[in-house]
């Protein structure tokens, strides 16, 4: 008995070969002897039943001259899994067709952190093994269900599942979209008074995107977090529902989500969490955003540089006179110089030598007041 593996919804070709390598009479039947189709000597394909009943069944007329009389079954269904009989030259050939199906749990659009379950449906009597490969090359194998917990952004793309049965294999491709922001976290460094822009690009594209979102902000100086803005997203159009009066944020009306803070002030420095709840999805997308604000000031004989917001302990804050060695450099959030020399002073926030933020302040001779460029 010949075994053919097929995929639900696709086509299968069941072979039937003549030893004569020429056109001959043949008939394809179900195992209960009902005729499917055949050729009875006139080179014409005769179907065994009503056209609607047998419209999925066909043969390759072009192959008949070479002694090949395949049965083509289109739009395969699970119930097509059975034995088919090819009768020719006073002999019968049995061909077993097994139709398989691999599906993803409920939806192929899943939130980051959710689980993906791939299920194999197979015909009775079969004992296939299945192995699936993720877009990032990770292999998972198992029985009829395979699960991946904690989906990551890199799991977005085409999953390839290979079903193996009796040394034959059939491959399934399933497109999975992991719904997430491109970045889990971002940090913005600004001088006091500068305009701040926050961007929240999504890592996926869909034709219609509907949901609602909110940005909660925990200022470093505040005891509790505060909702800065709430918005709706309908068919990729953003509309602001409510915005705090301080700060007065502006939000773009189209994707990617984009917010503008008129100016960076020490009281705004801190961390935010933007959440986006998508329609018909359980759970939310999250992106953390951090704001670090720098201020350089001169009061009487003291030149001070301060930063506010979430800085890592390895960041260095320095004060230096232009083109000279740093006068003071500390892993702290404030540095100062007493009785600074006249000239252009630079306050630098750096990470392993890379400058993240810079603020200049001009110190005038002692009889003058400082100028901030």
């Amino acid at each position: 008995k010949t075994l053919v593996l097929g995929k639900e919804g696709e086509s299968a070709e069941l072979p039937c070969e003549s030893s004569q390598k020429k056109i001959t009479v043949f008939t394809w039947k179900f195992s209960d002897q009902r005729k499917i189709l055949g050729q009875h000597g006139k080179g014409v394909l005769i179907r065994g039943g009503s056209p609607s009943q047998f419209d999925r069944f066909d043969s390759k007329k072009g192959a008949w001259e070479k002694g090949s009389f395949p049965l083509i079954i289109n739009k395969l269904k699970m119930e097509d899994s059975q034995t088919y009989i090819c009768e020719l030259e006073n002999r019968k050939e049995e061909v077993e067709l097994w139709v398989f199906k691999v599906t993803a749990n409920s939806d192929t659009h899943l939130l980051q952190g959710q689980s993906l379950t791939l299920t194999l449906e197979s015909p009775p009597g079969s004992s296939p093994s299945v192995q699936c490969r993720s877009p990032r090359g990770k292999n998972i194998q198992g029985g009829k269900t395979l699960s991946v917990s904690q989906l990551e952004l890199q799991d977005s793309g085409t999953w390839t599942c290979t079903v193996l049965q009796n040394q034959k294999k059939v491959e399934f491709k399933i497109d999975i979209v992991v719904l997430a922001f491109q970045k889990a976290s971002s940090i913005v460094y600004k001088k006091e008074g500068e305009q701040v822009e926050f961007s929240f690009p999504l890592a996926f594209t869909v034709e219609k995107l509907t949901g609602s979102g909110e940005l909660w902000w925990q200022a470093e100086r505040a005891s509790s977090s505060k909702s800065w803005i709430t918005f709706d997203l309908k068919n990729k159009e953003v509309s602001v529902k409510r915005v705090t009066q301080d700060p007065k944020l502006q939000m773009g009306k189209k994707l990617p989500l984009h917010l503008t803070l008129p100016q960076a002030l020490p009281q705004y420095a801190g961390s935010g969490n933007l959440t986006l709840a998508l329609e018909a999805k359980t759970g939310k997308l999250h992106q953390e955003v951090n704001l670090v604000v720098m201020r350089a000031t001169q009061l009487q004989k003291n030149l001070t540089c301060e930063v506010w917001g979430p800085t890592s302990p390895k960041l260095m804050l320095s004060l230096k006179l232009e083109n000279k060695e740093a006068k003071v450099s500390k892993r702290e959030k404030a540095v100062w110089v007493l009785n600074p020399e006249a000239g252009m002073w630079q306050c630098l926030l750096s990470d392993s030598g890379q400058v993240l933020l810079e603020s200049n302040i001009k110190v005038l001779p002692t009889w003058s007041t400082p100028v901030q460029p």
Epitope: Q195, K236, S239, V240, Q250, G252, T260, P262
Partner: antibody, heavy 119, light 107 residues
Framework: EVQLLESGGGLVQPGGSLRLSCAAS????????MSWVRQAPGKGLEWVSG????????YYADSVKGRFTISRDKSKNTLYLQMNSLRAEDTAVYYC????????????WGKGTTVTVSS | AIQMTQSPSSLSAFVGDRVTITCRAS??????LGWYQQKPGKAPKLLIY???SLQSGVPSRFSGSGSGTDFTLTISSLQPEDFATYYC?????????FGQGTKLEIK
């Protein structure tokens, strides 16, 4: 061919009302954002009001908020601007404009209709 | 509302000249900006959308650049039909706002 045709302009006294219409053809009217833009004699362009595509949210310039109402009739492929409590400074040519897919600029404009507010 | 400051307000140039018009937004608007051309008695016409994308059917001598707050419209080689008034429009969010316009005149 994509076309917009405004109508309903005319002379009206201060405090009066007018309703402008914009008949759209050649595109799926309900899918696109639409706007009204005006131009006072010898002056620049001023955006007046807008309505989003599938959602139908409405927006207004501060100068007309509370006096003008934008709406659309999808069955008639028509955009409207109801103008109440009209003032002399509302005198202008009013244009209807269609926005491109995903808000890629106002790609189609009507020829305009003139509104004159005078006693 | 976002303010759009366009400069210069008027400009005289010769046919064949390269001209540049600038537009500055009062806050960051990404690339959500369009440039429009208007001739006397006519409706405006879209030239550039999304700051730098050329609208279909518009000659390639027109180009746009910029993002955030500063934007530029450049006409590489002025043609007689380019003498008109040019406007920028922010469509970052509602209410939309136009620049004051730049009248481009023939020298």
């Amino acid at each position: 061919e994509v076309q917009l045709l405004e109508s309903g302009g005319g002379l009206v006294q201060p405090g009066g009302s007018l309703r402008l219409s914009c008949a759209a053809s050649g595109f799926t009217f309900s899918s696109y954002a639409m706007s009204w833009v005006r131009q006072a004699p010898g002056k620049g362009l001023e955006w007046v009001s807008g309505i989003s595509g599938s959602v139908g949210s409405t927006y207004y310039a501060d100068s007309v908020k509370g006096r003008f109402t934008i709406s659309r009739d999808k069955s008639k492929n028509t955009l409207y601007l109801q103008m109440n409590s009209l003032r002399a400074e509302d005198t202008a040519v009013y244009y209807c404009a269609k926005e491109g897919y995903d808000w890629s600029g106002m790609d189609v404009w009507g020829k305009g209709t003139t509104v004159t507010v005078s006693s | 509302a976002i303010q759009m400051t366009q400069s210069p307000s008027s400009l005289s140039a010769f046919v064949g000249d390269r001209v540049t018009i600038t537009c500055r937004a009062s806050q960051g608007i990404r690339n959500d900006l369009g440039w429009y051309q208007q001739k006397p008695g006519k409706a405006p016409k879209l030239l550039i959308y999304a700051a730098s994308s050329l609208q279909s059917g518009v000659p390639s001598r027109f180009s746009g650049s910029g993002s955030g707050t500063d934007f530029t419209l450049t006409i590489s080689s002025l043609q007689p039909e380019d003498f008109a008034t040019y406007y920028c429009l922010q469509d970052y969010n509602y209410p939309y706002t136009f620049g004051q316009g730049t009248k481009l005149e023939i020298k």
